[in-house]
């Protein structure tokens, strides 16, 4: 289990000509909010298909009213992160859709009106627990800058949040067969599996198969809130009206049956119907032994001579899981270089290479420029698997077919003059400034000496007025 987190940094006009009209006006003030939709794998599904990994909606941003005559700036954003919790393993590869919505706050009949301003989508590889990844996506004339990451919720760790960690019982080393939990070297990998159905929010376990409840929760799976006040009726009013939290009296509430057993109420209690291989009042006892052949895909069964002792499956290469039932995703190691598509054929790995690359792992860079032309005097630059054009002054785009003005985005700071140049642009800095784009004042203060405490920003600082 874990959380995918998305931080929107800015949403505003993209670079280049054709700045979009402001989405709000003095007559129609509005505010933005964002929606993110996540799907596992590198699927190219339609935007309408379900967000199988989860979805989230941001808060509303501050109200914005366009200043007449001013260029559309970056629009004010909602506070905070968008968080998409995931219950199972993090898939490592995922598709995302981020939508920017406008809420108009004029005198609409029947409340505010919503309209979709921009939608961006992409497919990414991402390991859980890694640093924030940054991204810029464009939708028409709009540009969205954002960061994202996936993090595991304790006790889960690892790039897929599938390993569990717990503090060491002995100071020097982990128990037999257990490894230290990188990066938490003071913790040990734990083969700890709580009772099936144990609430991940309100329950925990210190021994496999148990479910212990956090304060305020009860029931065999810690799904029943403990009463916090006296109530009017046996079932009590809802917490929304009085704050009274009362367990429903049904014996099957929260399903006390473990290991996929189904619960049915009896006049005095409950009864569990257990799946094959399990027995006991709550299906908590495994009746499977090595004699039953529980290990799949050629796994070797060890132990489990009688029903009360556990068996362990030692899996052959390429398989994992308590019964060797899962094929190891060897493609998760990303063996294909330069964006190649990995195919696990069982007996072998195969890489399907992008145009411009070859070799068993797509490691050979072919001549990207062979037979490719750049328009308007541009020259072809090799590398990256797709031909790139270095365009002549005044042209841009993939094949140098678009007219471009590198000075349109006001790239020079502090009053520097921008000049279009064959290499892109050149900033001629005002006296007292230097840097590629005049962003560094040589002597930032007019006074000959400063007070000992640094002044921070003052209204008189010359670099403030751009």
């Amino acid at each position: 289990a874990g959380v995918f987190e998305l931080q929107i940094h800015s949403f505003g006009p993209g670079p280049g000509p054709g700045a979009p009209r402001s989405p709000c006006s003095a007559r129609l003030p509005c505010r933005l909010f964002f929606r993110v939709c996540l799907k596992p794998g590198l699927s190219e599904e339609a935007a309408e298909s379900p967000c199988a990994l989860g979805a989230a909606l941001s808060a509303r941003g501050p109200v914005y009213t366009e200043q007449p005559g001013a260029p559309a700036p970056d629009l004010p954003l909602p506070d905070g992160l968008l968080q998409v919790p995931f219950r199972d393993a993090w898939p490592g590869t995922f598709s995302f859709i981020i939508e920017t919505w406008r809420e108009e706050l004029g005198d609409q009949i029947g409340g505010p009106a919503w309209s979709l301003l921009a939608r961006v989508a992409g497919r990414r590889r991402l390991a859980a627990g890694g640093p924030w990844a940054r991204d810029i996506q464009r939708a028409g004339a709009w540009e969205l800058r954002f960061s994202y990451r996936a993090r595991c919720e304790p006790p889960a760790v690892g790039t897929a949040c599938t390993r569990l960690c717990r503090p060491r019982s002995a100071p020097s080393r982990c128990g037999p067969g257990l490894r230290p939990c990188a990066p938490l070297e003071d913790e040990c990998e734990a083969p700890l599996v709580c009772r099936a159905g144990c609430s991940p929010e309100h329950g925990f376990c210190e021994q496999p198969g148990e479910c212990r409840c956090l304060e305020g929760w009860t029931g065999p799976l810690c799904t029943v809130p403990v009463s916090t006040s006296s109530c009017l009726s046996p079932r009590g009013p809802s917490s929304a009206t009085t704050g009274c939290l009362v367990p429903g009296p049904g014996p099957c509430d929260g399903n006390p049956c473990a290991n996929g057993g189904s619960c049915s109420e009896t006049p005095r209690s409950f009864e569990c119907t257990c799946p094959r291989g399990f027995y006991g009042l709550r299906c908590e006892v495994s009746g499977v032994t090595c004699a039953d052949g529980p290990c799949f895909n050629g796994g070797l069964c060890v132990g489990g001579a009688d029903p009360d002792s556990a068996y362990i499956c030692h899996c052959p290469p390429g398989f994992q899981g308590s019964n060797c039932e899962k094929r190891v995703d060897r493609c998760s190691l990303q063996p294909c270089r330069n964006g190649g598509l990995c195919l696990d054929l069982g007996h072998a790995l195969r890489c399907r290479c992008r145009a411009g690359f070859a070799g068993p792992r797509c490691e050979h860079d072919l001549d990207d420029c062979a037979g490719r032309a750049c328009a308007n005097g541009g020259t072809c630059v090799e590398g990256g698997g797709a031909h790139r054009c270095s365009c002549a002054l005044g042209f841009g785009g993939r094949d140098c077919r678009e007219r471009a003005d590198p000075c349109a985005a006001r790239p020079c700071a502090h009053g520097g003059r921008c000049y279009a140049h064959f290499s892109g642009l050149v900033c001629a800095c005002a006296p007292g400034y230097m840097g590629a784009r005049c962003e560094f004042p040589v002597h930032p203060d007019g006074a000959s000496a400063l007070p000992a405490a640094p002044p921070g920003l003052r209204p008189g600082d010359p670099q403030r007025y751009l």
Epitope: R134, P441, D461, R464
Partner: nanobody
Framework: EVQLVESGGGLVQPGGSLTLSCAAS????????LAWYRQAPGKKRELVAG???????HYIESVKGRFTISRDNAKNSVYLQMNSLRAEDTAVYYC???????????WGQGTLVTVSS
């Protein structure tokens, strides 16, 4: 807003080395040009070294070949590696960031470097 926190200052002997670090945080750390300035007692604050958001580096003459500025975009940090330090390098060193998002400059609180035997 961008907040800048410097560290790594201290007392060092002439000819010694020191590395200053500056961590940027806040809502506008997306595209920053970063620099180190210094101010000796009774003198103006001056630019020492800068690194633009495209990675190009700029140094004043007196530190070329001795000081190296670098940045780690993943950590939103800038570093100043100072070698062959001289007494005239003694100053309060300030971290500076120019945000291309807000088009505003931001300053750290400063860290004291003293070169003395």
């Amino acid at each position: 807003e961008v907040q800048l926190v410097e560290s790594g200052g201290g007392l060092v002997q002439p000819g010694g080395s020191l590395t200053l670090s500056c961590a940027a945080s806040g809502s506008d750390v997306w595209y920053l040009s970063l620099a180190w300035y210094r101010q000796a007692p009774g003198k103006k604050r001056e630019l020492v070294a800068g690194i633009s958001d495209d990675g190009s580096r700029h140094y004043i003459e007196s530190v070329k070949g001795r000081f190296t500025i670098s940045r780690d975009n993943a950590k939103n940090s800038v570093y100043l590696q100072m070698n062959s330090l001289r007494a005239e390098d003694t100053a309060v060193y300030y971290c500076y960031a120019y945000s291309w998002k807000t088009r505003f400059p931001y300053w750290g609180q400063g860290t004291l470097v003293t070169v003395s035997s």
